[in-house]
């Protein structure tokens, strides 16, 4: 009888020990299985979870626009006063709803190439007005022409055309015209076959971004989605030195197993450069734990503050010998037009940039860019890309519309907020397929280990107690 009890207790302890060992073994084995599954599923090839979502994003992406309506156009043109602006918006468009096209796998170098078609659909229900709402904004052609043609002879010619077309420093345009293009009356007078359509995003609809060639991750998962080349080149030809490199992914996803210490590098064709994001905080997105990576102020700093940025300063006059910060001259990428990119309301920009503009209210929460990345898969499940489009306008002695200006202005035209968040259905699916399974496996591991240890300890204590009792 005593033997039976002892044997039972030892058997219980052994079972507990086996369960604990099995739970312990399951930890690295389970992690290995998860890793193997993740590595298989994030590869960009037909049949994987990643590929399906990569071809056509399952996230609804909106681009909201706020237009800077100029309140004192005549005063600025006549007296070179501060420009008073009032933002109007949001005007919302649905974007990135089109699937990638011309998808071609290259098994030789483990890459996949594609183009991303552009399209925008106005969403009246998410907007404060219609596409026909009018705004007073800088005259894009009048501001750009003397910048492109800096020679005084041509400026006299341009002045004749500007006067003839009754154009001035500012103009009134509808949202649709401003964003997507309008026939400019001044450019229409140029007696050569030039493009006379002007718009901040012209041309956009029915155009494509790319060709992109990205690593599919088949041979090396740590390279998945990283851009190998853009438009057939590994460099942009816009910037000197390393600033010209195409680094990282397109920000839609990153190689899996993202650590907080990692700097996420990505290329954005909108700003004609590669940039980076650093870990900000851990957040819960619809029950999915994600890492929020933010664009640091350092990325927009002057070379004085961040020497790495020296090659993004390509012009010495407007940048006050590279001491100004928070604006990026992307003219080289925009056919020589004086386009400057910044954060909305000149967030993180030097005071000299925003000084000539009244009515700006930079706000970190509203105006910063962030990416919410699920760390195991590297998928960006939520993002907010915020940027502002500005045009440089300078005094031009030979152009009457600009001759009264006493200083250059970097004039804000609009700012945009492009956002995407994983849908509820997709989030549930993601939880079930990825985080749910990992949680479940973790729970099983912990349960086996816990139950095993408890069983082993309990049965061993009982056995010892029993033995000492019998001994007495």
């Amino acid at each position: 009888m005593g033997c039976d009890r002892n044997c039972g207790l030892i058997a219980g302890a052994v079972i507990g020990a086996v369960l604990a060992v099995f739970g312990g073994i399951l930890m690295p084995v389970g992690d290995m299985l998860i890793e193997k599954t993740i590595k298989r599923e994030v590869v960009l090839e037909e049949g994987t979870t990643a590929f399906k979502n990569w071809v056509k994003t399952g996230t609804t992406v909106y681009r909201q626009f706020w237009i800077f309506d100029v309140q004192n156009p005549d005063d600025v043109a006549k007296n070179s006063s501060k420009i008073k602006v009032k933002q109007r918006g949001p005007y919302t468009y649905r974007v990135r709803y089109l699937a990638k096209e011309n998808i071609t796998q290259d098994p030789e170098d483990h890459t996949v190439s594609f183009v991303q078609p552009n399209g925008a659909i106005f969403e009246p229900s998410l907007s404060v007005g219609t596409e026909d709402d009018n705004f007073t904004v800088l005259n894009l052609a009048v501001a750009a022409a003397p910048h492109i043609y800096q020679n005084s002879f041509v400026q006299v010619v341009l002045n004749s055309l500007i006067k003839k077309s009754k154009s001035s420093m500012f103009q009134t345009r509808s949202l649709k015209e401003l964003l997507w293009g309008y026939k400019d009356p001044f450019l229409s007078l140029v007696p050569y076959p030039i493009s006379t359509t002007v718009g901040v995003f012209y041309p956009y609809n029915d155009t494509v971004d790319g060709v992109y060639k990205v690593f599919n991750g088949k041979d090396n998962i740590s390279k998945v989605a990283i851009i190998e080349s853009y438009k057939g080149k590994r460099n942009l030809s816009y910037w000197p030195s390393y600033c010209d490199m195409i680094n990282g992914t397109d920000a839609a996803s990153f190689p899996p197993f993202v650590e907080k210490s990692r700097t996420l590098r990505f290329f954005s064709s909108d700003i004609c450069r590669s940039i980076y994001a650093v870990f900000g905080s851990e957040i819960d997105l619809k029950g999915i734990p994600v890492y929020r990576f933010v664009l640091p102020a350092n990325a927009f700093a002057s070379p004085l503050q961040n020497p790495d940025n020296h090659c993004f300063c390509t012009e010495k006059v407007i940048s006050n010998n590279c001491t100004s910060y928070g604006v990026l001259d992307i003219g080289k990428c925009k056919e020589g037009k004086p386009v400057y990119i910044s954060l909305p309301h000149f967030l993180h920009a030097s005071p000299d940039v925003s000084e000539p503009i009244e009515g700006l209210h930079p706000n970190e929460d509203e105006h910063r860019t962030y990416l919410d990345v699920e760390p195991i898969t590297g998928f960006t499940l939520q993002f907010a890309k915020r940027l502002q489009v500005n045009i440089l306008v300078k005094p031009a002695r030979k152009i009457e519309a600009l001759k009264n200006l006493k200083r250059p202005y970097i004039v804000p035209i609009l700012w945009l907020n492009e956002t995407g968040t994983i849908g509820d259905e997709k989030a549930e699916m993601f939880k079930t397929q990825v985080t749910g399974k990992i949680k479940l496996l973790g729970m099983v591991e912990m349960a086996l280990l816990g139950i095993g240890v408890v069983m082993f300890v309990a049965f061993m204590i009982s056995y010892c107690a029993c033995k000492s009792k019998n001994g007495k």
């Epitope: 020679n151 002879f153 010619v157 003839k164 007696p191």
Partner: antibody, heavy 117, light 107 residues
Framework: EVQLVESGGGLVQPGGSLRLSCAAS????????IHWVRQAPGKGLEWVAW????????YYADSVKGRFTISADTSKNTAYLQMNSLRAEDTAVYYC??????????WGQGTLVTVSS | DIQMTQSPSSLSASVGDRVTITCRAS??????VAWYQQKPGKAPKLLIS???SLYSGVPSRFSGSGSGTDFTLTISSLQPEDFATYYC?????????FGQGTKVEIK
């Protein structure tokens, strides 16, 4: 086809006047503006005057300022160079030429102006 | 006014030769330089604008280079019809100014 035809040249006494015409076809002078360029016998080219597009400003070489006047009649698509107080050094072949960005892509055949007593 | 100094003022060459004519501006004119060819008794003909841009219909043996103050017209292989006088011109500032010309003669 773009064509420029000058006329009005001839022999004139020092201190005299002459009006040169430049009839354009194949384009509108209003959109381009017109220049006059001259070439003294055996010498190089010298820019003389310019009328900017759409009846814009007029510009002259220092050597002719105050004596020569450039004008255009858009209805006739013709440019003119009114030359007063002519001097011996104004003797040259006068060309009218079309330009927009400052280089001359079309030239007339030229008309000879001789200033001599 | 911007002075344009051409050199040489004349040169002798044979058919098939490579010929180079230079032009120097008295101040920076960026790439706003044109080149013309003129034959006796005829109006000048545009060869090159914006320092390097070959005008339509001009044979590809003609090429232009340079930026700022120093410019060059090159004829890669001289043809019989190329014997003429060549002028550079700046189209950066009014008054527009020409070089004094380079006469290319048969050796």
């Amino acid at each position: 086809e773009v064509q420029l035809v000058e006329s009005g040249g001839g022999l004139v006494q020092p201190g005299g006047s002459l009006r040169l015409s430049c009839a354009a076809s194949g384009f509108t002078i209003d959109a381009f503006g017109i220049h006059w360029v001259r070439q003294a016998p055996g010498k190089g080219l010298e820019w003389v005057a310019w009328i900017a597009p759409y009846g814009g400003e007029t510009y002259y070489a220092d050597s002719v300022k105050g004596r020569f006047t450039i004008s255009a009649d858009t209805s006739k698509n013709t440019a003119y160079l009114q030359m007063n107080s002519l001097r011996a050094e104004d003797t040259a072949v006068y060309y009218c030429a079309r330009s927009f960005f400052g280089y001359f892509d079309y030239w007339g055949q030229g008309t000879l102006v001789t200033v001599s007593s | 006014d911007i002075q344009m100094t051409q050199s040489p003022s004349s040169l002798s060459a044979s058919v098939g030769d490579r010929v180079t004519i230079t032009c120097r501006a008295s101040q920076d004119v960026s790439n706003w330089v044109a080149w013309y060819q003129q034959k006796p008794g005829k109006a000048p003909k545009l060869l090159i604008s914006y320092a390097t841009s070959l005008y339509s219909g001009v044979p590809s043996r003609f090429s232009g280079s340079g930026s700022g103050t120093d410019f060059t017209l090159t004829i890669s292989s001289l043809q019989p019809e190329d014997f003429a006088t060549y002028y550079c011109q700046q189209h950066s500032n009014a008054p527009l100014t020409f070089g004094q010309g380079t006469k290319v003669e048969i050796k």
